[in-house]
């Protein structure tokens, strides 16, 4: 005759408060004759959870019809789960005896634990912007999950990062846990449009991880390059000088013109354009009056970007006698 096996397939069952838990138990033989009972815990203090023959178990129902002659499925459902229901559940076969049934074999047990989903990961970047080629730190936090086992990954534009440190607290037993991870990211000049992603995988999420994102645009400062040029064309007695401020981020920019060290207050024409990589270009035109009595003029384009120290470029204006005499356009 085949030896009876008590099969409880799940070692761990995660449930959420208020839901129904299904505890599986099947037997491999109908012999010996006798009932199958469910208990929580072991030892003299173990608690009877279900006995088909006697007792009142309002929250427990059976998955199969236990009165059927050849039934081998003794799985049960426990409704309205509360934190008090956690523990290890055993299905136990008893052999019919007199005056009392005698315990024959126990299943290996299924641990019922409260599963709690992690909160949506929150990613925080550095407090101040940093320039390319430097390293910045991002933190990712998620709270309230259980059990403690959790996986956290970092990505930059879809590429997995390896330079990060993760802690799960508390270290001991707890109702819920928190995870905090800090990733170190080297900024590239084109990172204005980049994203870092913190991805959290947990057993309660059924393979659908949670993600938190941060835009590197919040962390990066791309300083501008400046170029001041004198236009070859002239209109009447005015020369057009251009200051090109290229590839900067963020947009915050102050530009001032100085003529021989004196700040010019008059209006100048300018345009702002956005590059494909998210950086900006700013072009400012400055018209200088040319007259016979003028000495050489030194023009300065000064740019203050995102509250940083001002940078400037100078241009010594080249005005020839020919230019002074002629109204026609000429190349200096």
């Amino acid at each position: 005759e085949e030896e009876l096996q008590m099969i409880q397939p799940e070692k761990l069952l995660l449930v959420t408060v208020g839901k129904t838990a299904t505890l599986h138990c099947t037997v491999t033989s109908l012999l010996p004759v006798g009932p199958v009972l469910w208990f929580r815990g072991v030892g003299p203090g173990r608690e009877l959870i279900y006995n088909q023959k006697e007792g009142h178990f309002p929250r427990v129902t059976t998955v199969s019809d236990l009165t059927k002659r050849n039934n081998m499925d003794f799985s049960i459902r426990i409704s309205s789960i509360t934190p008090a229901d956690v523990g290890t559940y055993y299905c136990v076969k008893f052999r019919k005896g007199s005056p009392e049934n005698v315990e024959f074999k126990s299943g290996p047990g299924t641990e019922m634990a409260l599963g709690a989903k992690p909160s949506a990961p929150v990613v925080l970047g550095p407090a101040a912007r940093t320039t390319p080629e430097h390293t910045v730190s991002f933190t990712c936090e998620s709270h309230g999950f259980s059990p403690r086992d959790i996986t956290l990954k970092w990505f930059k534009n879809g590429n997995e990062l390896s330079d990060f440190q993760t802690n799960v607290d508390p270290t001991g037993q707890s109702v819920a846990y928190s995870i905090r991870s800090t990733a170190r990211v080297v900024l590239d000049p084109w990172d204005v449009r980049s994203q870092v992603i913190c991805e959290v995988a947990h057993v309660t999420l059924q393979g659908d991880p949670l993600r938190g994102t941060a835009n590197l645009s919040e962390a990066i400062r791309v300083p501008p390059t400046l170029e001041v040029t004198q236009q070859p064309m002239r209109v009447g007695n005015q020369v057009n000088v251009t200051c090109q401020v290229r590839k900067f981020y963020p947009q915050s920019l102050q530009l001032t013109w100085s003529e021989n060290g004196n700040v010019c207050q008059r209006e100048t024409a300018s345009t702002l354009t956005e590059n494909k990589d998210g950086t900006y270009n700013w072009t400012s035109w400055f018209l200088v009056n040319i007259s016979d009595q003028r000495d050489d003029v030194v023009l300065t384009c000064q740019v203050k970007h995102d509250g940083q120290l001002a940078v400037s470029k100078r241009l010594a204006l080249e005005v020839t006698v020919h230019q002074k005499d002629q109204s026609s356009d000429a190349t200096p």
């Epitope: 030892g43 003299p44 203090g45 173990r46 608690e47 005896g97 009392e100 049934n101 005698v102 315990e103």
Partner: antibody, heavy 122, light 107 residues
Framework: EVQLVQSGAEVVKPGASVKLSCKAS????????MHWVKQAPGQGLEWIGA????????TYNQKFKGKATLTVDKSASTAYMELSSLRSEDTAVYYC???????????????WGQGTLVTVSS | DIQMTQSPSSLSASVGDRVTITCRAS??????LNWLQQKPGKAPKRLIY???SLDSGVPSRFSGSGSGTEFTLTISSLQPEDFATYYC?????????FGGGTKVEIK
């Protein structure tokens, strides 16, 4: 009628061992956990541990681990407790009592043996 | 381990007196508490199980109440045969623990 009958009084020398017995009658021996309780002269009660005859599963009070060893003989419906390396502080009355195979409130410690006095003396 | 603190450790009373003994558990044990009576040279005898359920043959002058961590045994009218030592016992969690006992003596 359920009865738990314990072996007679023992006088033993320090360092020796002694094995006490508790024979159950009147119900299915294997359906119950057999517990052992110590009561030193003029003192209160202390739970030592328990054994489940079905599979000889044991549970001990940490304080008595290494001091007490619980065994059963199912065929004789008898539980045993061996006390080792005896010292004067082990002088006490030792009781057996029982509880049901799960924690049915009505079946905890309702039946008790009459007790066995163990005197440790040189 | 769960500690059971019983008070008083002894009391003197007269026949007909109302006697109250309390037991405090160091953590919640629900209602899993027994009250035992022990007379000199005899094995303990259970009077009450599950905090308030009277064992068969136990006089109705004995009653138990409480839950969680605070429990009380009351003898409504003390009789000569009630002079004994009383113990509370928790069976909620292993190791199972007893109170220190209350000796009820004749005044």
């Amino acid at each position: 009628e359920v009865q738990l009958v314990q072996s007679g009084a023992e006088v033993v020398k320090p360092g020796a061992s002694v094995k006490l017995s508790c024979k159950a009658s009147g119900s299915t021996f294997t359906s119950y956990w057999m517990h052992w309780v110590k009561q030193a002269p003029g003192q209160g009660l202390e739970w030592i541990g328990a054994i489940y005859p079905v599979n000889s599963d044991t549970t001990y009070n940490q304080k008595f681990k290494g001091k007490a060893t619980l065994t059963v003989d199912k065929s004789a419906s008898t539980a045993y407790m061996e006390l080792s390396s005896l010292r004067s502080e082990d002088t006490a009355v030792y009781y057996c009592t029982r509880s049901f195979y799960y924690s049915l409130d009505a079946a905890w410690f309702v039946y008790w043996g009459q007790g066995t006095l163990v005197t440790v003396s040189s | 381990d769960i500690q059971m603190t019983q008070s008083p450790s002894s009391l003197s009373a007269s026949v007909g007196d109302r006697v109250t003994i309390t037991c405090r558990a160091s953590q919640d044990i629900g209602s899993r508490l027994n009250w035992l009576q022990q007379k000199p040279g005899k094995a303990p005898k259970r009077l009450i199980y599950a905090t308030s359920s009277l064992d068969s043959g136990v006089p109705s002058r004995f009653s138990g109440s409480g839950s969680g961590t605070e429990f009380t045994l009351t003898i409504s009218s003390l009789q000569p045969e009630d002079f004994a030592t009383y113990y509370c016992l928790q069976y909620a969690s292993s190791p199972f623990t007893f109170g220190g006992g209350t000796k009820v003596e004749i005044k």
